[in-house]
């Protein structure tokens, strides 16, 4: 047991934020500026991610953790760890190779990113269109046309809410 302990790697004692410096008799040296080690026992420190150009710093690099980037205003992150920035568009638009374009009739986008999606087809659920769709908003489906026959109420009252775990009376 004592023999095992004496053969233990001296580098394992170096904490996060340091590296085991082979040039200085394997003593623990602090990570140089703009580098970090997030775990103990490291033989080198890693260079920090640099948030540059379209990227902006969300979290500064420290001796124990890497920098984190996000995108400058007008752009949003794509990819693992925000490896890319995609241009924002307005609601009612989608991003194409030629920039932001309005959604075609019959489609909508309620976000600054993503693609225009088709309006819901109410008739597939046997319902009618209560509120028309726009470039920014989906249609709102209402009761089925049969429910709107003369003498029928045009608005169905909501069913009473049930508390979770309770069976109906």
């Amino acid at each position: 047991f004592e023999r095992t302990r004496s053969l233990q790697d001296p580098c394992s004692n170096c904490p996060a934020g340091t590296f085991c410096d082979n040039n200085r008799n394997q003593i623990c040296s602090p990570c140089p500026p703009n580098s970090f080690s997030s775990a103990g026992g490291q033989r080198t420190c890693d260079i920090c991610r640099q948030c540059k150009g379209v990227f902006r710093t969300r979290k500064e690099c420290s001796s124990t953790s890497n920098a984190e980037c996000d995108c400058t205003p007008g752009f949003h992150c794509l990819g693992a760890g925000c490896s890319m920035c995609e241009q924002d568009c307005k609601q009612g638009q989608e991003l194409t190779k030629k920039g932001c374009k309005d959604c075609c009739f019959g489609t909508f986008n309620d976000q600054k990113r993503g693609i225009c999606r088709p309006w819901t087809n109410c008739s597939l659920d046997g319902k009618s269109v209560l509120v028309n769709g726009t470039k920014e908003r989906d249609v709102v489906c209402g009761p089925s046309p049969a429910d709107l026959s003369p003498g029928a109420s045009s608005v169905t009252p909501p069913a009473p809410a049930r508390e979770p775990g309770h069976s109906p009376q």
């Epitope: 080198t44 890693d46 260079i47 920090c48 991610r49 640099q50 540059k52 150009g53 379209v54 990227f55 400058t72 205003p73 007008g74 752009f75 794509l78 990819g79 693992a80 760890g81 490896s83 890319m84 920035c85 995609e86 241009q87 991003l95 194409t96 190779k97 030629k98 920039g99």
Partner: antibody, heavy 123, light 106 residues
């Protein structure tokens, strides 16, 4: 259509300075998110990144050349510049201007390049 | 600086061959890697960005993979116009390029 056209290359004496220009069209150097930089290639060698300036006027330089480089731009002319001082024979290269990112998606790559301008440092 | 090491430095291949070029980073760089093609006397052309995204207009025979330290550019079926030099480039910290891989006709 994005275009980058470099100029200012030619024969320069060792110890001298040069100022390269890159005229951009099809986009504005001051558009949010845009970064444009300089990359060089010595005859028969690989690519070496030199400097980049972004729309917010943040500047980035190669550490090994930082003391001799100045990157700048003139928004009114939509033109990028590179000043390189204390020229040496090893600075002989084709100097390219390149724009960071692609069209709708931006990042740390170069989608648009100029044709390059040759700088020869010799006495 | 983060170093990028490409292998092989050069290779000979025939039309129709599957060609693989590797790029190894001196430390983890996530997916912040691009690949370029360069022909003599011409500027480099972007092929792949963010390790695996094909640039618009680039033929689908080109593909990229990898993350962290090891990356690969694959040409599934080499065409006559693909004989060129290929470079990888990282943008994780300041920009650096690999030394290049020349693809020659066998």
């Amino acid at each position: 259509e994005v275009q980058l056209v470099e100029s200012g290359g030619g024969l320069v004496q060792p110890g001298g300075s040069l100022r390269l220009s890159c005229a951009a069209s099809g986009f504005s150097l001051s558009t949010s998110g845009v970064g444009v930089g300089w990359i060089r290639q010595a005859p028969g060698k690989g690519l070496e990144w030199l400097a980049l300036i972004d729309w917010a006027d943040d500047k980035y330089y190669s550490p090994s050349l930082k003391s001799r480089l100045t990157i700048s731009r003139d928004n009114s002319k939509n033109t990028l510049y590179l000043q390189l001082n204390s020229l040496r024979a090893e600075d002989t290269a084709v100097y390219y201007c390149a724009r960071g990112g692609s069209d709708a998606v931006l990042g740390d790559w170069f989608a648009y390049w100029g044709q390059g301008t040759l700088v020869t440092v010799s006495s | 600086d983060i170093q990028l090491t490409q292998s092989p430095s050069s290779l000979s291949a025939s039309v129709g061959d599957r060609v693989t070029i590797t790029c190894r980073a001196s430390q983890g760089i996530g997916s912040y890697l691009a690949w370029y093609q360069q022909k003599p006397g011409k500027a480099p052309k972007l092929l792949i960005y963010d390790a695996s995204n094909l640039e618009t207009g680039v033929p689908s025979r080109f593909s990229g993979s990898g993350s962290g330290t090891d990356f690969t550019l694959t040409i599934s079926s080499l065409q006559p116009e693909d004989f060129a030099t290929y470079y990888c480039q990282q943008g994780y910290s300041i920009w650096t390029f690999g030394q290049g891989t020349k693809v020659e006709i066998k």
